[in-house]
């Protein structure tokens, strides 16, 4: 079964900076990934970032730099102040889409514990929804 | 199917602004983003920005950053671009496009003359 | 910015021939997490709006005729078109998928003799 991770991680330089990593455990072939915040992308989340592995990047405010770190993984970095900002516990949601699994969601936030430049390992997040 | 509806012309004054729209249906509006393209006489395809209508965020080519305000209405499933300080070189085609260009409306006109 | 280059500005040939046409772009339009490059080619018929033709380089959008052929990586780019028709009269703009703002280039004029 495929699976998606997420990892949430606050600059230790900004603290109103955090990167966003996810990634595709899987054997399909990615068609297209968003990134969204404060939930799943379509139920009340807001989207942040689309990565086509062919058609390129587009990104929003308060997202900053969204590339490909492999063929299988992403990376986001946001940045913001005043209401646009995101905080410690904001929801971060990353929705794969693939041939021939379908669409995998999961999302994450910043370990409660941690501390600027520390994040959790790159662990495999629940999967909310799969369609 | 995927439509993007806009009026056919705008005739307007120096120093106006205009506020064109472009009409999405066939698709849910707030998960595909709208860019706008200018196209000048005699000259190339021009990026200006683009807008997601479900975060209504915008990102603008710096060249139009002071001029053009992009904005969505939701309800009525429609983009809209305003174009401010109008001079005759904004005298254009302008193309709304959706998310990476690969559906197009028919664009509108703009016509700068007093 | 990144600045799109097409050469030549225009040309034209007899139905049936094939034709070349270049992209030169500023900066190297190829994503290293995935090794895609991202750019596509328009193709804008007289009174219509354009229309997508090729994406990442070299993949046609489903529909096109597969005499449009794409290839090139980084900044060095070229659409052919193995047997050029009369409703391939148009102008071919390519663009730069790459990064903010997505810069076309001045494009090719295709016409039939």
């Known amino acids: 079964t495929p699976e998606v991770w997420v990892q949430v991680r606050m600059e230790a330089t900004e603290l109103s900076s955090f990167t966003i990593r996810c990634g595709f455990l899987g054997s399909g072939s990615i068609s297209l990934v968003t990134v969204s915040w404060g939930g799943p992308n379509g139920a009340g989340g807001t989207t942040l970032a689309v990565l086509h592995p062919e058609r390129g990047i587009r990104q929003w405010a308060p997202a900053r730099q969204a590339r490909w770190e492999t063929q299988s993984s992403i990376s986001l970095i946001l940045e913001g102040s005043g209401a646009s900002s995101p905080c410690a516990n904001t929801t971060f949601c990353c929705k794969f889409a693939s041939f021939p699994e379908g669409s995998w969601e999961a999302c994450g936030s910043l370990p409660p514990s941690s501390d600027p430049g520390l994040s959790a390992p790159p662990t495999p997040a629940p999967i909310l929804r799969a369609d | 199917q995927v439509q993007l509806q806009q009026p056919g012309a705008e005739l307007v004054k120096p120093g106006t602004s205009v506020k064109l729209s472009c009409k999405a249906s066939?698709?849910?509006?707030?998960s595909y983003w709208i860019n706008w393209v200018k196209l000048a006489p005699g000259q190339g395809l021009e990026w200006?920005?683009?807008?997601?209508?479900?975060?209504?965020?915008?990102n603008y080519n710096e060249k139009f950053k002071n001029r053009a305000t992009l904005t969505v209405d939701t309800s009525a499933s429609t983009a809209y671009m305003e174009l401010s300080s109008l001079a005759s070189e904004d005298s254009a085609l302008y193309y709304c496009?959706?998310?990476?260009?690969?559906?197009w409306g028919q664009g509108t006109t703009v016509t700068v003359s007093s | 910015d990144i600045v799109m280059t097409q050469s030549p500005s225009s040309l034209s040939v007899s139905a049936g021939e094939k034709v070349t046409m270049s992209c030169k772009s500023s900066?190297?339009?190829?994503?290293?997490?995935?090794?895609?490059?991202?750019l596509a080619w328009y193709q804008q018929k007289p009174g219509q709006p354009p229309k997508l033709l090729i994406y990442?380089?070299?993949t046609r959008e489903s529909g096109v005729p597969d005499r449009f052929t794409g290839s090139g990586s980084g900044t060095d780019f070229t659409l052919t078109i193995s047997s050029v028709q009369a409703e391939d009269l148009a102008v071919y703009y390519c663009?730069?998928?790459?990064?903010?703002?997505?810069?076309f280039g001045g494009g090719t004029k295709l016409e039939i003799k």
């Open positions: 900066q190297s339009l190829l994503s290293s997490g995935n090794q895609k490059n991202y």
């Open positions: 066939g698709y849910t509006f707030t």
């Open positions: 200006i920005g683009d807008i997601y209508p479900g975060s209504y965020i915008p």
């Open positions: 496009a959706g998310g990476y260009f690969d559906v």
């Open positions: 663009q730069n998928d790459h990064s903010y703002p997505y810069t």
């Open positions: 990442g380089a070299s």
